[in-house]
């Protein structure tokens, strides 16, 4: 059975998939769909990696992990929920049937209505973390500075998030990342 | 419009071998994974194997993987399967069929050749 | 390996019956079922995919449906065309797999 994320709608939801390349730089093509994998690619796909870099990708689907080091978890932007359901993603190991293919259940709760009158803002800007622009040359990161004026809901939506960091690691150390080589 | 051409079948004795061709046309073939299936006369379909966009995955009916080996030459627009220490069940015809595209979505063969017949018999 | 069972094996019918052939899977394949149609002496074709997305060229009296286990494909209107025989096929599991094929024929 799939394992189950969480996410709010108008929130970023976080889905996570790790592999370790063979070599730095010795990269694997990764893709991510809408829907259960199917025994070959990643049903509708919304995003994927070559051995170089992201090659295709739709719009609020984004990697903010080190793709290049193997985190390929894949960020949803501002989720509606319609974008419910479950999601693969395929680790395509070249030779004779060696992918590696997850299935992650995303499950979207109605946003909790807070009488707070701060300005909403997205929860990365909250948590300093790397992004990777999209695009076809080099990758670029930048680090997002945190803001002062944080509301409660980013507060529970930061736990939130630390929470799914814990988890993501714990998912690593309990043996979900992939190595290769 | 889309085209696929087997060539290569034809009679062999029990043990010996075949490559079988498949010539696409119509399509960016390296968009597309592709497959091999066959039918022994009579019978159903069965699946043989598939090979990703640029064939460096390759996927195969476990009783056949030691002795087929499915390949492809995209600078050709070729598909190619090498069949050794061929059997008399493995007679059937072959079909060519373009499979998934690079971006998923439609999970069925949308395309077949015309088919090859290979005969394994002494 | 996932076991594809369709009923029935064979079906007579007459040009203007509705017909529906069932595949059941033996295990969930969510939507990954296809739909083929094979003259005698002929390649097969693709009628429908993702268990209910009609293939270029069909004809709409073609109907899919289904998800999970168990699947459908419906002939509104049987034309003399399409007596012949049809196969469903999943494409979640490998190795992929065909149903063993429910042979339409004329009454």
């Known amino acids: 059975s799939e394992v189950e994320y969480r996410a709010e709608v108008g929130q970023n939801a976080y889905l996570p998939c790790f592999y370790t390349p063979a070599a730095p730089g010795n990269l694997v093509p990764v893709c991510w769909g809408k829907g259960a994998c199917p025994v070959f690619e990643c049903g509708n796909v919304v995003l994927r990696t070559d051995e170089r870099d992201v090659n295709y990708w739709t719009s609020r689907y984004w990697l903010n992990g080190d793709f290049r080091k193997g985190d390929v978890s894949l960020t949803i932007e501002n989720v509606t929920l319609a974008d419910s359901g479950i999601y693969c993603c395929r680790i395509q190991i070249p030779g004779i049937m060696n992918d590696e293919k997850f299935n992650l259940k995303l499950v979207i709760k109605p946003a909790k209505v807070t009488p707070a009158p701060t300005r909403q803002r997205d929860f990365t800007a909250a948590f300093p973390r790397m992004l990777t622009t999209r695009g076809h040359g080099p990758a670029e990161t930048q680090t997002l500075g945190s803001l002062p004026d944080i509301n409660l809901t980013q507060i529970s939506t930061l736990a939130n998030e630390l929470r799914d960091s814990r988890l993501a690691n714990d998912l690593r150390d309990s043996g979900a990342t992939i190595r290769i080589g | 419009e889309v085209q696929l051409v087997e060539s290569g079948g034809g009679l062999v004795q029990p043990g010996g071998s075949l490559r079988l061709s498949c010539a696409a046309s119509g399509f960016t073939f390296s968009d597309y994974y592709m497959a091999w299936v066959r039918q022994a006369p009579g019978k159903g379909l069965e699946w043989v194997a598939n090979i990703n966009y640029d064939g460096s995955s390759t996927y195969y009916l476990d009783s056949l993987k030691s002795r087929f080996t499915i390949s492809r030459d995209n600078a050709k627009n070729s598909l190619y399967l090498q069949m050794n220490s061929l059997r008399a069940e493995d007679t059937a015809v072959y079909y060519c069929?373009?499979?998934?595209?690079?971006?998923?979505?439609?999970?069925?063969?949308?395309?077949w050749g015309q088919g090859t017949l290979v005969t394994v018999s002494s | 390996d996932i076991q594809m069972t369709q009923s029935p094996s064979s079906l007579s019918a007459s040009v203007g019956d509705r017909v529906t052939i069932t595949c059941r899977a033996s295990?969930?394949?969510?939507?990954?079922l296809a739909w083929y149609q094979q003259k005698p002496g002929k390649s097969p074709q693709l009628l429908v995919y993702?268990?209910?997305t009609l293939a270029e060229g069909v004809p709409s009296r073609f109907s899919g449906s289904g998800s999970g286990t168990d699947f459908t494909l419906t002939i509104s209107s049987l034309q003399p065309e399409d007596f012949a025989t049809y196969y469903c096929?999943?494409?979640?599991?490998?190795?992929?797999?065909f149903g063993q094929g429910t042979k339409l024929e004329i009454k």
């Open positions: 069929a373009r499979d998934v595209g690079y971006y998923g979505g439609n999970y069925g063969f949308a395309y």
């Open positions: 096929q999943q494409h979640y599991g490998s190795p992929l797999t």
């Open positions: 993702n268990a209910k």
């Open positions: 295990d969930n394949i969510y939507s990954y």
